[in-house]
């Protein structure tokens, strides 16, 4: 008789990434008998929740349930019913909620309470909703990309099965850009991590890793833009802000109350003689770059070297995966290719920012104007952050790999978070076993 496959023995996990600008739900799947193997967990679904981040629901918490419904119901469809009760669900909130908590711990708790109540209504094994720290966000992003790239596997291969694989066990650094924060995480070369807050020690699959990480709150792309506007309006002579980070001909009215709503602009807050001002784009990359640099305080460093704002940063080492908004923005600008030098990226940004707004709108007719209008700023901000903030150079630029997915799984902190919480990354290398014989009878 012919061998026939047994029903697959798989497990699932769900992680919700409650970011500052939106929430995404990820569903992961893995073979049950290979939980401790490296690289076996993969993403089977991403569901982007329609609407803004959960922190925006602070005055309408009773709507959080309906906001999450479509994606939670999607999870119910994707995961077989027999697996529902044993499928863990985790929600991690990032910098948007960190900012809300800074303003009011009570309001942040209220949002999380309603989130927990909503998620508890589903047939899954809900494990809690919490605000993860910036350090965790950096660490889990680093774990995710190295897990997916096979860097924790002790088996060396003569062939490459994943992109960017260099067949050595040197880990990749992780560069994550969100709306409200940005993280840099990597293993420095024989370098003491001079500030304990930035040091992580892991033992993964029998190997020790001393990892540097830092999360810069308020330096995600959206909050960086609010900071820049708040800084620039201080010196505007009237309610017109001629802004080099927006295309020539672009106009937009901004409410001062919106500008000062975030804790990120507190340091620039002042009494203005108007309630609204108008941004008028002038589209000049160089001037935009200069304006962004003023957000980075590089005049003070209590360590051997710093990134900015007095934060220790060891010398950069090895290759880096740049994901989340680093990838989305550069992908839109068509600048993710490994062949594009930093000089070429700068050149392309100069041209892009100088293009008239009417021309841009025609060229990208399908893109929402709010997003479209901010790519000049975001692209320029990414260059400024990587070059002046983190000290990448024209030479080391080629070590940055803009990554959206690896092996079909999104690069980001969620996979690493689930691997950790489900104890799927052992400290010690599992004993190698012969090929499983349980698949066929």
């Amino acid at each position: 008789t012919q061998n026939k496959a047994l029903p697959e023995n798989v497990k699932y996990g769900i992680v919700l990434d409650a970011g500052s600008s939106h929430t995404s739900l990820y569903i992961y799947k893995w073979p049950a008998e290979k939980e401790n193997d490296t690289g076996v967990v993969h993403q089977v679904e991403e569901c982007r929740v329609k609407g803004p981040g959960i922190s925006k629901f602070v005055q309408k918490v009773n709507e959080i349930g309906i906001y999450l419904t479509d994606c939670m119901e999607r999870a119910r469809e994707v995961i077989p019913r027999s697996q529902h009760q044993e499928t863990p669900v985790y929600l991690g909130a990032t910098a948007g909620m960190r900012l809300l908590r800074m303003e009011s711990e009570e309001l942040a708790d209220r949002v999380l309470d309603v989130v927990e109540r909503s998620l508890s209504n589903y047939p899954f094994d809900f494990q809690g909703a919490r605000i993860i720290t910036g350090q965790e966000e950096g660490a889990y992003g680093w774990i995710t990309i190295n897990y997916l790239l096979g860097k924790f596997s002790q088996k060396t291969r003569w062939f490459s099965i994943v992109p960017y694989e260099t067949n050595n066990q040197e880990t990749f650094g992780a560069l994550d850009l969100g709306g409200a924060s940005t993280q840099v995480t990597f293993v420095p070369q024989n370098q003491t991590i001079e500030s304990p807050d930035n040091a992580l020690q892991f033992r993964l699959y029998g190997k020790d890793y001393n990892v540097y990480t830092h999360s810069f709150l308020c330096y995600g792309k959206d909050q960086a833009l609010w900071q820049k506007l708040a800084k620039d309006i201080q010196v505007a002579s009237n309610e017109i802000l001629r802004d080099p980070c927006f295309h020539p001909g672009y106009k937009k009215v901004v409410n001062v109350s919106d500008l000062y709503k975030t804790p990120c602009t507190k340091r620039f807050e002042m009494t203005l003689p108007f309630q609204q001002f108008e941004i008028q784009g002038i589209g000049n990359y160089q001037q935009c770059h200069q304006s962004i640099l003023e957000l980075f305080n590089t005049s003070y460093c209590p360590y051997s070297q710093c990134a900015f704002n007095g934060i220790f940063l060891p010398p950069l080492q090895g290759d880096f995966g740049a994901f989340s908004a680093f990838y989305f923005v550069m992908k839109f600008l068509n600048l993710t290719s490994e062949k594009v030098s930093q000089e070429k990226v700068t050149e392309m940004m100069k041209k892009f920012c100088a293009q008239p707004w009417e021309e841009i709108k025609t060229s990208y007719a399908g893109v929402k104007e709010k997003y479209l209008s901010e790519y000049c700023f975001s692209g320029t901000y990414i260059l400024s952050l990587l070059l002046q903030g983190y000290h990448f150079t024209a030479d080391s630029w080629e070590h940055i790999h803009f990554i959206g997915k690896i092996q079909g799984s999104d690069a980001g902190w969620t996979l690493g978070y689930m691997l950790n919480l489900t104890n799927m990354i052992p400290a010690e290398q599992p004993l190698s076993t012969p090929l499983s014989h349980s698949t066929y009878v």
Epitope: S20, S21, H22, K50, G51, P52, G53, K56, F57, Q59, K60, E63, I66, Y67, T69, D70, E73, G96, G179, D222, V254, N255, D258, K368, K370
Partner: nanobody
């Protein structure tokens, strides 16, 4: 613009049922969420039940198991079937159609349309 017209309210005894209807007209392709809010005298307006464009639903704890929201896309109408009514369900019931903004600035809702309301009174 979207116009919403409620019907089906009235006076009913405890334990009985009512079915509210909300007919939508106008530019409704921009709407993902529809729902029913209610407001009793001296109270804030509260969300009772909501339904998404995909037909998924959500209910306030106080009405779970008693009320059912449904949507007939062909007729552009949303219904609220209210069973086992209680005196505390007495309120003006408003139909609401909305969609959320994706942006971190400005209001939470990009579109927000309301009906005039229909009175539901549950007598003991």
């Amino acid at each position: 613009q979207v116009q919403l017209q409620e019907s089906g309210g009235g006076l009913v005894q405890t334990g009985r049922s009512l079915r509210l209807s909300c007919a939508a007209s106008g530019d409704i392709f921009s709407i993902n969420y529809m729902g029913w809010y209610r407001q009793a005298p001296g109270n804030e307006r509260e969300l009772v039940a909501a339904i998404t464009g995909r037909g998924n639903t959500n209910y306030a704890d106080s009405v779970k198991g008693r009320f059912t929201i449904s949507r007939d896309n062909a007729k552009n109408t949303v219904y609220l079937q209210m069973n086992s009514l209680k005196p505390e369900d007495t309120a003006v019931y408003y139909c609401n159609a909305w969609d959320y903004s994706d942006y971190d600035e400005g209001p939470l809702r990009e579109y927000d349309y309301w009906g005039q309301g229909t009175q539901v009174t549950v007598s003991s």
